[in-house]
């Protein structure tokens, strides 16, 4: 895949190694940790990003911070198994043979078990609710301006078509962005809502995954929108299977 032509870097993923060894001497980039070739015109899958993040040397892992708001059942970061397309494998296990099932965004959706645990299919996360609290401003943002700006941001920065931004709700200082995407709705080249949400989350935390691009500078009619808290809720096409003791 072609990356940036002039200096052979990957604009959409700084956690890559790039070299001009593609067809015809074109720039090709591979994700750290997995060595999988990535398409630098679009977002890299969250699974490959998480794998790259875990492979980085501890002292060089400038992108990693304690993730106080991550809704991953407090499991935190883990080194995932990805399929050849870069998607999470339905079953994930750690080095101590503890296994669990995940959804398409890599969030655990069952109790933990042993190697005998079966995860029949990768269950799709079809609805993501991004809950933001913005810092105090002189007045509330205009709702329609905020809606338009967030749709533009998700299209231009994360390449997510506005059809997948189902709604933007606003009650100062809380903003809720609803992303919806069924398996059947994804057409060729469409970005996955899970990947868009992950890139957005990292941007909001000041841990941008983009190469050489400035951090997230979100403005609504020139007024800076600064996020001070993020919570992300994931809804799967099939409800999760946790025991009652949870």
């Amino acid at each position: 895949h072609t990356a940036a032509q002039d200096n052979c870097t990957c604009p959409t993923n700084k956690m890559t190694v790039c070299s001009p060894d593609g067809p015809g001497g074109r720039c090709q980039c591979r994700a750290l940790g997995s060595g999988v070739a990535v398409d630098c015109s679009t977002l890299t899958s969250e699974c490959l990003l998480l794998k790259a993040r875990m492979s980085a040397p501890k002292n060089a892992r400038t992108l990693v911070r304690p993730n106080e708001h991550a809704l991953v059942d407090n499991d935190g970061l883990y080194d995932p198994d990805c399929d050849p397309e870069g998607r999470f494998k339905a079953r994930q296990c750690n080095q101590t043979s503890v296994c669990w099932c995940v959804n398409s965004v890599g969030v655990r959706r069952t109790d933990k078990g042993d190697l005998s645990l079966r995860c029949d299919e990768l269950v799709r996360t079809h609805h993501i609710l991004i809950d933001l609290r913005h810092r105090p401003t002189a007045g509330a943002f205009n709702h329609s301006d905020l809606d338009a700006e967030l749709r533009r941001l998700f299209r231009e920065r994360y390449r997510l078509h506005p059809k997948f931004v189902a709604a933007v709700h606003y009650e100062q200082p809380t903003i809720q962005i609803e992303l919806r995407q069924n398996t059947s709705q994804k057409a060729a080249g469409d970005v996955d809502i899970g990947d868009a949400a992950y890139y957005f989350e990292r941007d909001v935390k000041g841990e941008s995954l983009f190469q050489g691009r400035g951090g997230l500078d979100l403005r609504v009619r020139g007024e800076p929108l600064q996020v001070e808290r993020t919570l992300i809720y994931y809804l799967d096409e099939i409800p999760p299977k946790f025991s009652m003791k949870r």
Epitope: Q5, S41, S184
Partner: antibody, heavy 119, light 108 residues
Framework: QVQLVQSGAEVKKPGASVKVSCKAS????????MHWVRQAPGQGLEWMGE????????SYNQKFKGRVTITRDTSTSTAYMELSSLRSEDTAVYYC????????????WGQGTLVTVSS | DIQMTQSPSSLSASVGDRVTITCRAS??????LNWYQQKPGKAPKLLIY???RLESGVPSRFSGSGSGTDFTLTISSLQPEDFATYFC??????????FGQGTKLEIK
């Protein structure tokens, strides 16, 4: 091989509506965006709108102010573009084109349908 | 809407010439720029997508470059079948997606 075959030329009177069809073959119809682009005689290309055949979602060029409607019939792998309240400046060749969700590039085009608006 | 401006509007060249057509966007469009070739009475044909990626089956004499607002389409050695009209198109932002006005390449 991928093919987009459009309906034949139309002559319409001002104020009337026209519905152009585009039958797709050679690929999974619901897996690609379908766009409509028009070209007035001797002029450039103008994007009119798009649809995802999987769920009938459409978005449109606001220039057409609600005059354009794009639909599809998945059972026949056919997309349709209807333009209402026709005026003489709508005389153009209308193309359907298969699109890519990320690049928004149009890799296969129909042969075009000439719509003439004349009283 | 993003405006796309091509230059020149027309140009004359000979077989074997190296030809460059430029396209300028009214705002940053990253690399989401596509090029098409159209011959009289025919539908446009995709040549290059995402600034520099050659569409399958397109001869390697066609190449594209640029980023941000300024882009170029280069034909390294003109062939008789290359005389046509060329359009650029952006796919960066929210709809509508917009085209340049076209560059007509004629035989000198």
């Amino acid at each position: 091989q991928v093919q987009l075959v459009q309906s034949g030329a139309e002559v319409k009177k001002p104020g009337a509506s026209v519905k152009v069809s585009c039958k797709a073959s050679g690929y999974t119809f619901t897996s690609y965006w379908m766009h409509w682009v028009r070209q007035a005689p001797g002029q450039g290309l103008e994007w009119m709108g798009e649809i995802t055949p999987s769920d009938n979602y459409g978005s449109y060029n606001q220039k057409f102010k609600g005059r354009v409607t794009i639909t599809r019939d998945t059972s026949t792998s056919t997309a349709y573009m209807e333009l209402s309240s026709l005026r003489s400046e709508d005389t153009a060749v209308y193309y359907c084109a298969r699109g890519h969700g990320n690049y928004v590039s149009f890799d296969y085009w129909g042969q075009g349908t000439l719509v003439t608006v004349s009283s | 809407d993003i405006q796309m401006t091509q230059s020149p509007s027309s140009l004359s060249a000979s077989v074997g010439d190296r030809v460059t057509i430029t396209c300028r966007a009214s705002q940053d469009i990253s690399n989401y720029l596509n090029w098409y070739q159209q011959k009289p009475g025919k539908a446009p044909k995709l040549l290059i997508y995402y600034t520099s990626r050659l569409e399958s089956g397109v001869p390697s004499r066609f190449s594209g470059s640029g980023s941000g607002t300024d882009f170029t389409l280069t034909i390294s050695s003109l062939q008789p079948e290359d005389f046509a009209t060329y359009f650029c198109q952006q796919g960066y932002t929210l709809p509508p997606y917009t085209f340049g006005q076209g560059t007509k390449l004629e035989i000198k």
